[in-house]
Interface confidence: low
């Protein structure tokens, strides 16, 4: 039959596109295209992505899989989810560390490095908000400590000298 071929594929289902001469069924996620179909509405030859490579979407044209990313050890990143045939490695920060983005318009694919969370206990402070999107949020001084300058200082145990208000339970009141 003469004339130009219509770009629309008259095949059952909607997962067909013109590849080469014919409308072919595409490859599922996790597979790459080895060869297009050899008859109208036929199946393409698809192969599973090799180890350490992936393809996240159904496709009609990818003849190779994408290489899985390696988490940046220099940036203290760890793999939260290992790479599979259908998904890239998901890099993040280990417990006790938080994500510090390296770019301004930050999205999930933006480069980042991991920073250690502030240890409120080591600063003798209550933990008000656990470290997640940003650093730990430390609160007031723990019992037995009082605010002095920027830090928490251990309450005096002796009743000699002054006794800060927050330390009344430790060193008692003096007139």
């Amino acid at each position: 039959q003469g004339g130009t071929r219509s770009p629309r594929c008259d095949c059952a289902g909607d997962f067909h596109k013109k590849i080469g001469l014919f409308c072919c069924r595409g490859c599922p996620a996790g597979h790459y295209l080895k060869a297009p179909c050899t008859e109208p509405c036929g199946n393409s030859t698809c192969l599973v992505c090799p180890q350490d490579t992936f393809l996240a979407w159904e496709n009609h044209h990818n003849s190779e899989c994408a290489r899985c990313q390696a988490c940046d050890e220099q940036a203290s990143q760890v793999a939260l989810e290992n790479c599979s045939a259908v998904a890239d490695t998901r890099c993040g920060c280990k417990p006790g560390w938080f994500v510090e983005c390296q770019v301004s318009q930050c999205v999930s694919s933006s480069p980042f490095y991991c920073q250690p969370c502030l240890d409120c206990g080591a600063l003798h402070r209550h933990t008000r908000l656990l470290c997640s999107r940003r650093d730990t949020d430390c609160g007031t001084c723990l019992p037995g400590f009082y605010e002095h300058g920027d830090g928490c200082v251990s309450c005096p145990t002796s009743t000699l000298g002054s006794c800060p208000e927050r330390c009344a339970a430790v060193c008692g009141w003096r007139q």
Epitope: V99, S104, L118, L129, R133, R134, D150
Partner: antibody, heavy 121, light 115 residues
């Protein structure tokens, strides 16, 4: 188009209160951290307060801590700054400014046009 | 918290070029900063972020005439082929987390006059 529109400014006496509002549109409000930044006449920019996307983390500048309260209503796409015990040094243009979404990034990528607060007896 | 130092003024001839400097306190020379442009009686506008390695990303609608670079604790904003609309005050700013508290500091601003 991202828009931030401040309101609620005006003339107030020392010791009085004002509440500023910032209405947001053109982006998913609940995904973004927000800040108030002020600018006294002829002076530079001074950060005032910060609130995280779900109000879980709030921070204030030393100059306003204990007097100002930042809050937000994600259902109404609104940011607020309750200003109590106003002082003459609070006189400034007040801007709301958006933090980009996602992780602990430091940027203020969109600003409102500002609302003027004047504290005078 | 970081301290950002800017010179108060700079001038540039029309179609010429100008380079603005923002200097971080030395112990925080690795900090990323942000440049803002504020035209008279207008709100600040995001120009770009600028990392310690000189990489940067500009905001929407910022012309190619604007570029950033870094050297040690210094962060630079360069404007080439200066236009009359570049007449503005340029602030650098840096966000930080200190003892669990998030905040911002800004430089005092550099007023650029286009001659």
């Amino acid at each position: 188009e991202v828009q931030l529109v401040e309101s609620g400014g005006g003339l107030s006496q020392p010791g009085n209160s004002l509440q500023l509002s910032c209405e947001a549109s053109g982006f998913t409000f609940s995904n973004h951290d927000l800040n108030w930044v002020r600018q006294a006449p002829g002076k530079g920019l001074e950060w005032v307060a910060y609130i995280s996307s779900a109000s879980g983390l709030i921070s204030y500048a030393d100059a306003v801590r204990g007097r100002f309260t930042i809050s937000r209503d994600n259902a109404k796409n609104s940011l607020f700054l309750q200003m109590n015990n106003l002082k003459s040094e609070d006189t400034a243009m007040y801007y709301c400014a958006r933090d980009p979404a996602y992780t602990g990034l430091y940027a203020l990528d969109f600003w409102g046009q500002g609302t003027q607060v004047t504290v005078s007896s | 918290q970081p301290v950002l130092t800017q010179s108060p003024s700079a001038s540039a001839s029309l179609s010429g070029s100008v380079k603005l400097t923002c200097t971080l306190s030395s112990e925080l020379s690795w900090y990323t900063i942000v440049w803002y442009q504020q035209r008279p009686d207008k709100a600040p506008k995001y120009v770009m972020y600028l990392k310690s390695d000189g990489s940067h990303s500009k905001g929407d609608g910022i012309p190619d005439r604007f570029s950033g670079s870094s050297s040690g604790a210094h962060r630079y904003l360069s404007i080439s082929n200066v236009q009359s609309e570049d007449d503005a005050t340029y602030f650098c700013g840096a966000g930080y987390t200190l003892a669990g508290q998030y905040g911002w500091v800004f430089g005092s601003g550099t007023k650029v006059t286009v001659l």
